[in-house]
């Protein structure tokens, strides 16, 4: 089958890193600078991705593979193949259109990216709050009040926010 295909389509012989040049009797020509072909039998080479601005080059383009980008310090990748760079925030913040914004009461973010998440609802597991949550850290759940030995006590959770209504812990 391969031999038949080769006889019918001379382009199938062109390896990755080349293209089948119709202007030159379908000779396999090397990809021009700043272009690549990652598979054989291609009639054109693809233009290399350029990592500009907030993007920086993680892997240079070669004749057989595209360039790969990541983000400059202070930014992180989003999307397939790092299609976007998004600004980092501090722990205890999340990114909005206005920029980095402190987590709302009842939420936390322990990373420089992503969104603020609610504190764990300890009562769901029949536990109580051992350590209060902050903007940067989740609450720490401890044994339920009934499990505590005499004299021991757990931290009283802060009053839930009114707007929006965060569930009591």
């Amino acid at each position: 089958f391969e031999r038949t295909r080769s006889l019918q389509d001379p382009c199938s012989n062109c390896p990755a890193g080349t293209f089948c040049d119709n202007n030159r009797n379908q000779i396999c020509s090397p990809c021009p600078p700043n272009s690549f072909s990652s598979a054989g039998g291609q009639r054109t080479c693809d233009i290399c991705r350029q990592c500009k601005g907030v993007f920086r080059t993680r892997k240079e383009c070669s004749s057989t593979s595209n360039a790969e980008c990541d983000c400059t310090p202070g930014f992180h990748c989003l999307g397939a193949g790092c299609s976007m760079c998004e600004q980092d925030c501090k722990q205890g913040q999340e990114l909005t259109k206005k920029g980095c914004k402190d987590c709302c009461f009842g939420t936390f973010n322990d990373q420089k990216r992503g969104i603020c998440r609610p504190w764990t609802n300890c009562s769901l597991d029949g536990k109580s709050v051992l350590v209060n949550g902050t903007k940067e850290r989740d609450v720490v759940c401890g044994p339920s009040p009934a499990d505590l030995s005499p004299g021991a006590s757990s931290v009283t959770p802060p009053a839930p926010a009114r707007e929006p209504g965060h569930s009591p812990q």
């Epitope: 989003l78 998004e86 999340e94 990114l95 909005t96 259109k97 206005k98 914004k101 709302c104 009842g106 939420t107 992503g114 969104i115 603020c116 998440r117 609610p118 504190w119 764990t120 609802n121 769901l124 989740d138 707007e163 929006p164 965060h166 569930s167």
Partner: antibody, heavy 121, light 111 residues
Framework: EVQLVQSGAEVKKPGSSVKVSCKAS????????IYWVRQAPGQGLEWIGN????????FYGEKFMGRATFTADTSTSTAYMELSSLRSEDTAVYYC??????????????WGQGTLVTVSS | SVELTQPPSVSVSPGQTARITCKLN????????VHWYQQKPGQAPVTMIY?????PDGIPERFSGSSDSSSNSAFLTISGVQAEDEADYYC??????????FGGGTKLTVL
């Protein structure tokens, strides 16, 4: 493929409760907010509240505090919304929706097909 | 608190351009992401525009989003309107990063 599949239509009596489910597939259930939104017949969209399935943390719209309860079962990737003390004005289509984790003011990228809850005596 | 106001209805002939307005009552529209959903009868909403002007995969280029600080409004523009574009359209933003706010919806009628 990301999907949110909701439970079927319900007819309830005033004063009773309803529990709507939203089964997620095609993504990591614990890493995205699930929002609950409702739409009364011929009306617009109204936020009920939301849950972070990763730890069960919840937020409720002021109008629904004390009446709505959100839970999530991570073993089945299913979120639940229970609404108690039903009245006729709770008749609506109830939607679950997923919010991406890119930014704090992001859109809802996937929605369930909706569950019609009819409250009638 | 944040409120978004939309006209109840917009009518347009096939092939013409429709523009749906979403007006922010307070604050600066430039500080808020606005998202747009299309909803057809008996169906769930579908994202047409997110983060002001971005189009999800599969949404035709006829749909575009923009905003104008002088009128403190966001806009959904549909160029070359087709019969299948007849639907309700909702804008969406946030009061706080937890609390979503929706416009009242605009019914687009294709004459």
């Amino acid at each position: 493929e990301v999907q949110l599949v909701q439970s079927g239509a319900e007819v309830k009596k005033p004063g009773s409760s309803v529990k709507v489910s939203c089964k997620a597939s095609g993504y990591t259930f614990t890493s995205y907010y699930i929002y609950w939104v409702r739409q009364a017949p011929g009306q617009g969209l109204e936020w009920i509240g939301n849950i972070w399935p990763g730890n069960g943390g919840t937020f409720y719209g002021e109008k629904f505090m004390g009446r709505a309860t959100f839970t999530a079962d991570t073993s089945t990737s299913t979120a639940y919304m229970e609404l108690s003390s039903l009245r006729s004005e709770d008749t609506a289509v109830y939607y679950c929706a997923r919010r991406p984790d890119y930014s704090g003011d992001d859109y809802f990228d996937y929605w369930g097909q909706g569950t019609l809850v009819t409250v009638s005596s | 608190s944040v409120e978004l106001t939309q006209p109840p209805s917009v009518s347009v002939s096939p092939g013409q351009t429709a523009r749906i307005t979403c007006k922010l009552n307070s604050g600066n529209i430039g500080s808020y992401y606005v998202h747009w959903y299309q909803q057809k009868p008996g169906q769930a909403p579908v994202t047409m525009i997110y983060r002001d002007d971005k189009r999800p995969d599969g949404i035709p280029e006829r749909f575009s989003g923009s905003s104008d600080s002088s009128s403190n409004s966001a806009f959904l523009t549909i160029s070359g309107v087709q019969a299948e574009d007849e639907a309700d359209y909702y804008c969406h933003s946030y009061d706080s990063t937890i609390t979503p706010v929706f416009g009242g919806g605009t019914k687009l009628t294709v004459l």
